[in-house]
């Protein structure tokens, strides 16, 4: 059997702190027996040089004197092979060797799991010289052991170009279970199975896992770590944790919330960011997502006019960036706007409806039936038209803009007249005789100038010509109407 220094197997506190039996600061092995001669403990290793049998790594000195026989082989004395202790306890172990005084400058180094331990370690080497030999004791101490101190420790001494290696001292630090994998929070579909994983390690092993749901243990029998809990499905939110226990005590994982995916809450704070004659830019604050990412949103728009037919326009958009420009709206109109968003489970209810208005726009159509005729007696051109339909004025009519272009013998001159909204006729004075006058009219609102009507041309003769006939906006398809006298 492996020679062990074993502490009594006692559980220790879940959290560090004052607690009966936990304040011991140093640990002296209870057993420190030599190995039987030539015994190499299981689970231990010592690096050896290639081609050399390992018997605790012995160096045979080559130095001989005239009257003396060869010196005996050098080797570290056997010591305790396995020390088991609890986390946060102190431990001290050593290796010793007797070296003939003919050797100078001998140093001992400590190695752990094949790597030299340099600095920041409590290693002390003491020398006890005698007539022929010097006993060297190298001590290594750790004031408060941690799991990372687990491993195989050896001493090495270089002498006469030979390396002497001690038997290993295996340190096993035992403590409460330590989680290597804890359950993770999840969002799951209602009544759908899912798995949670929990893994904890010692030493000491085994580590057993109990699952806890909403403060109730799920399994009567512990499961050896690692453990996977298959939950057949939930209908409401639950908190899960796992409890890992070994012979030192038990440790509790973090509690994780398992949420049930649901339809989202309706968006809140729908607000108007900008309004034009034919569009409204809205933003909203998304509601709670129901533990499932938003996929898209729907903007519902209905005319607020009580005389409207109540039909709803629906505009679909992506869930981000919580902003949407509603287009193709009528000018100077009132609308009710609501927003609804969806996730994988379904659509939210519609947000509280908000009222929004479009602004005045420039008229969308030109005045109709434009007629132009020459009043020769007063040397004026009379213009008549029909108001554009009210629906298409896109605002309150403030007047009209008349463009009249006079062309004669390569000279062209454009003039603009503004007239009030009352009436549907205007009179302009003749600018040039023996010329063509082209007239176009646009309706004007506070929102701007609408499109001009199709051009109507009239020829203004030189003085003394007889009569004239009116010129008017052509029927669709006839371009460039010219009145020929």
């Amino acid at each position: 059997a492996i020679t062990e220094a074993r502490e009594e197997a006692k559980p220790y506190p879940l959290f560090p702190g004052p607690f009966p039996g936990s304040l011991q600061t140093d640990h002296t092995p209870l057993l420190s027996l030599p190995h039987a001669s030539g015994y190499q403990p299981a689970l231990m290793f010592s690096p050896t040089q290639p081609g050399r049998p390992h018997t605790g790594n012995v160096a045979i000195p080559q130095v001989t004197s005239v009257e003396s026989k060869p010196l005996p082989p050098l080797a570290f004395k056997h010591t305790v092979g396995h020390i088991i202790l609890s986390e946060h306890k102190g431990v001290k172990f050593n290796c010793s060797i007797s070296v003939p005084n003919i050797y100078q400058d001998t140093t001992i180094s400590w190695w752990k799991d094949g790597k030299e331990l340099l600095g920041a370690h409590h290693a002390i080497t003491q020398f006890y010289p005698d007539d022929e030999v010097t006993a060297i004791i190298a001590s290594f101490s750790i004031t408060s052991v941690q799991r990372s101190d687990n491993g195989s420790y050896i001493c090495k001494m270089k002498i006469n170009n030979e390396e002497i290696v001690s038997d290993p001292i295996y340190i096993e630090v035992q403590g409460l279970p330590h989680f290597t994998k804890q359950p993770e929070s999840m969002n799951v579909t209602r009544n759908t199975a899912f798995n949670l994983t929990c893994q904890a390690v010692g030493p000491p092993e085994p580590v057993n896992i109990f699952w806890v749901q909403n403060s109730s243990r799920v399994n009567e029998q512990p499961e050896k770590s690692p453990s996977v809990l298959t939950v057949p499905g939930l209908t409401e939110m639950a908190v899960f944790s796992c409890e890992a226990h070994n012979d030192k005590g038990l440790t509790v994982s973090k509690g994780v919330q398992i949420n049930i995916k649901a339809i989202p809450s309706p968006p809140t704070e729908v607000s108007i960011r900008n309004s034009t004659a034919h569009s409204i830019l809205i933003s909203w604050v998304p509601g709670f997502d129901g533990y499932s990412p938003f996929r898209n949103c729907s903007i519902q728009v209905k005319e607020a006019d009580p005389l409207s037919n109540g039909s709803v326009m629906i505009f679909n958009t992506s869930a981000l960036p919580h902003l949407y420009q509603i287009k193709q709206l009528q000018a100077l109109a009132n609308y009710s706007i609501g927003v609804s968003c969806m996730n994988e489970i379904g659509w939210s209810a519609v947000s509280p409806w908000i009222l929004a208005s479009t602004t005045e726009g420039a008229p969308s159509v030109a005045p109709l039936n434009v007629t132009v005729f020459l009043n020769e007696s007063s040397d004026n051109v009379d213009i008549r038209w029909m108001k554009p339909p009210t629906k298409q004025q896109d605002g309150e009519l403030v007047g009209y803009r008349i463009s009249h272009v006079w062309q004669s013998a390569g000279i062209s001159k454009e003039l603009l007249e503004e007239v009030g909204q009352n009436g549907s006729r205007a009179r302009i004075s003749v600018q040039v005789h023996n010329a063509t006058c082209t007239v176009r009219i646009a309706a004007v609102t506070r929102g701007g100038v609408g499109p001009f009507s199709d051009p109507v041309k009239i020829f203004i003769p030189a003085h003394g010509w007889v009569d004239y006939a009116p010129s008017s906006t052509p029927a669709p398809g006839n371009a460039d109407p010219v009145l020929i006298i």
């Epitope: 559980p11 879940l14 000491p204 403060s215 944790s241």
Partner: antibody, heavy 114, light 109 residues
């Protein structure tokens, strides 16, 4: 389902040694630490000893010199021996799961009398 | 020797809430004491209610809950029922041994 069942003599004489066996089913003793607990008639419960999954043991310090707990994992049995029995040791003896005292045997009543 | 103290008796009306406590002579009770609560009706084996990290044993209704209140372990029973009338023992772990309290006799009036 984990079940524990105690067995042992109903009557022992003073100074004799009591040997009780707890047979575990539904789980391996390599995964389950087992405690022994007793209850004298009309009195409170008293913890006696535990045997750990790894085979280590701990005892009630007042009774330590008289108690030995051991297990045979292959037989799924935990054995408690108590030496030098006295009439005050008359009680119902239970074995139970250790960290959670939630799996108990039905108990075995031991009377110490000459 | 550590002593664990419980109220000798307590009474509660049906449907009422009661909190039983468990004090240690060594000082404040902590999570490291792994407080266990056990229910025992006359002539029956004990039945574990709460253990480990204040988790309910399988099959124990959520009317029973364990906690640490101030420096004591506590067992709270909400919506008390007639069959909750029993003896309740707490057990605290002290590094290498359990210590049981003297028990509380709960009467549901």
């Amino acid at each position: 389902q984990v079940t524990l069942k105690e067995s042992g003599p109903v009557l022992v004489k003073p100074t004799e040694t009591l040997t009780l066996t707890c047979t575990v089913s539904g789980i391996s003793l390599s995964s389950f630490a087992i405690s022994w607990i007793r209850q004298p008639p009309g009195k409170a419960l008293e913890w006696l000893a535990v045997i750990w999954t790894g085979g280590g043991t701990d005892y009630n310090s007042a009774l330590k010199s008289r108690l030995t707990i051991s297990k045979d994992t292959s037989k799924s049995q935990v054995v408690l021996t108590m030496t030098n029995m006295d009439p005050v040791d008359t009680a119902t003896y239970y074995c139970a799961s250790h960290w959670y005292l939630d799996v108990w045997g039905q108990g075995t009543t031991v009377t110490v009398s000459s | 020797q550590t002593v664990v103290t419980q109220e000798p008796s307590f009474s509660v009306s049906p449907g009422g809430t009661v909190t039983l406590t468990c004090r240690s002579s060594t000082g404040a009770v902590s999570t490291s004491n792994y407080a266990n609560w056990v229910q025992q009706t006359p002539g029956q084996a004990p039945r574990g209610l709460i253990g480990g990290a204040n988790s309910r044993a399988p099959g124990i209704p959520d009317r029973f809950s364990g906690s640490i209140l101030g420096n004591k372990a506590a067992l709270t029973i909400t919506g008390a029922q007639a069959d909750d009338e029993s003896d309740y023992y707490c057990a605290l772990w002290f590094s290498n041994h359990w210590v049981f309290g003297g028990g509380t006799k709960l009467t549901v009036l």
